[in-house]
Amino acid sequence: IVNGSDCQKDAQPWQGALLLGPNKLYCGAVLISPQWLLTAAHCRKPVFRIRLGHHSMSPVYESGQQMFQGIKSIPHPGYSHPGHSNDLMLIKMNRKIRDSHSVKPVEIACDCATEGTRCMVSGWGTTSSSHNNFPKVLQCLNITVLSEERCKNSYPGQIDKTMFCAGDEEGRDSCQGDSGGPVVCNGKLQGLVSWGDFPCAQRNRPGVYTNLCEFVKWIKDTMNSN
C-alpha cells in the first residue's frame, strides 16, 4: 500500500497473508468463512502457508495469530494467466479458524459498488514501487470507487465487468504484495486487489480490483460442492 497508514490492530480481522517458505509474503487473502479464503487467481502457487490474525509484517509471534495450510486451491475457471479477467481463487484451509477478535470472516457484497463509494483496501505490500520498502505493520488506505467510464479511459481495452477501478489522489494506491487482499466498502467485501499500472500510484492510473459482486453465485456454489 502506497501512502496508507497503519491499520488499527484487529480492525481487519479477515485479512490474511499468503507466505512462501517460512515467512515470505507474496499475496494477501481474505477470510470469507470459517474454512475458506478468497485471493487473486494469479496468486496460485503449489505450496504456501496462510497466516491470519497477524498485525506485524515480521514473523514475530503474535497472540492472535493462526497459521494454516491450503488443502484446495480453486481458481475461477474463467481466469487465464497472464490475463486479469476473473481474477479470483478460493482456498480451503486444512481446518476451521478459532473465531476471535483477531480472526473473523467478512461478508461478500451482493450488490456491485457504485461510483463514489468509499472503501478500505489493506495489505502488507510494498510502500513504494522500488520493491524494497515494506511496512512494519498492516497498512490501510481509503479509496474511492471510480466510474466505469473513467476506469476504461485509464486502461483502454483492458477493463471488463469482472473488474472495477478505485483510487484516490495521485500517490495513494495498492502495490506489489497486496494482491488478493480485501477492498471493504460499507462493511462488506467488494473487491480483491488485482492489478494496476507499474509503478503503482500514478496519476490517472488507478488500482484495478476483482469485482466480487459478479461472482457471488460461483463462490457459494464452489464452497458448497467442496
Epitope: Y26, C27, A40, C43, G83, Q176, S179, W195, G196
Partner: antibody, heavy 126, light 107 residues
C-alpha cells in the same frame, strides 16, 4: 509454437542508427512484458531494456539511456529497439526475451525471461 | 544498481560429477533470482526462477537454493548436454543485472 524472431541487425558506422525488430508468435503478445538483452563477443549477458505489456513502464540500462528507445506494437505482435548514436561497445548479439513477470499484477513474485529469440548481430565499426 | 557476482568463472568437471555454482547479490533480493543456461551460439534458457523453482521441462538434476544475497545452482549429476555457461540474474529491481557467468567445461 511460442517463438520470437529478431531482425534488423547489421554493420553500421559509429554514430549511426539501426532499428531492431522482434516478431512474436504462438502466445498473446500483448499480455507480456518484454526485454532486450545483448551479449558482446566472448562476453556475458547484459540487460538493455524493458517494456511493460501496455508500454506504460519502460526502463533502460545506464549504458544505453538517451540513445536507445524500446517500443512495441501489440496489434502487430512486434517489439522494437531503435538504436541511435551507436558506439563500438554496442557491438553484440541482441536478443529479445519474454518476461514472465507481470509488473501490472500486484503480487510480490518475480520469475525471469522464459522465451528468447535466436538473436540478431549488430556490428559497429568504421 | 545491484551487482551480481558469480563464482567460479569456470569449472572443469566430468560426467556424473556434482557441480555447484554460487551467485552473490550486492544487496538483499529475497528469493528473486533466476538461473539461465547458454550453449555456444544459442540463446539463453531459463532453468530456475524464484531461486529454487524449476522451470517447466528442466531436468530435476538442476536445483537452486538461497535467499537474501547468497544463492546456489547445483547440478547433481552432470550430463554431457549440461556443458554450457550458466548465468544468474536478479529480477525484482531495475535495472535487471546478470552475473558474469560460469563456464562448465569437460575435464
Amino acid at each position: 509454437e511460442v517463438q520470437l524472431v529478431e531482425s534488423g541487425g547489421g554493420l553500421v558506422q559509429p554514430g549511426g542508427s539501426l532499428r531492431l525488430s522482434c516478431a512474436a508468435s504462438g502466445f498473446t503478445f500483448g499480455s507480456y512484458a518484454m526485454n532486450w538483452v545483448r551479449q558482446a563477443p566472448g562476453k556475458g549477458l547484459e540487460w538493455v531494456s524493458y517494456i511493460s505489456s501496455s508500454s506504460s513502464f519502460i526502463d533502460y540500462a545506464d549504458s544505453v539511456k538517451g540513445r536507445f528507445t524500446i517500443s512495441r506494437d501489440n496489434a502487430k505482435n512486434s517489439l522494437y529497439l531503435q538504436m541511435n548514436s551507436l558506439r563500438a561497445e554496442d557491438t553484440a548479439v541482441y536478443y529479445c526475451a519474454r518476461d514472465l513477470t507481470s509488473m501490472q499484477s500486484r503480487d510480490y513474485y518475480y520469475y525471469g525471461m522464459d522465451v528468447w529469440g535466436q538473436g540478431t548481430t549488430v556490428t559497429v565499426s568504421s | 544498481d545491484i551487482q551480481m557476482t558469480q563464482s567460479p568463472s569456470s569449472v572443469s568437471a566430468s560426467v556424473g560429477d556434482r557441480v555447484t555454482i554460487t551467485c552473490r547479490a550486492s544487496q538483499g533480493i529475497s528469493s528473486w533470482l533466476a538461473w539461465y543456461q547458454q550453449k555456444p551460439g544459442k540463446a539463453p534458457k531459463l532453468l530456475i526462477y524464484a531461486a529454487s523453482s524449476l522451470q517447466s521441462g528442466v531436468p530435476s538434476r538442476f536445483s537452486g537454493s538461497g535467499s537474501g544475497t547468497d544463492f546456489t545452482l547445483t547440478i547433481s549429476s552432470l550430463q554431457p548436454e549440461d556443458f554450457a555457461t550458466y548465468y544468474c540474474q536478479q529480477v525484482p529491481i531495475f535495472p535487471y543485472t546478470f552475473g558474469g557467468g560460469t563456464k562448465v567445461e569437460i575435464k
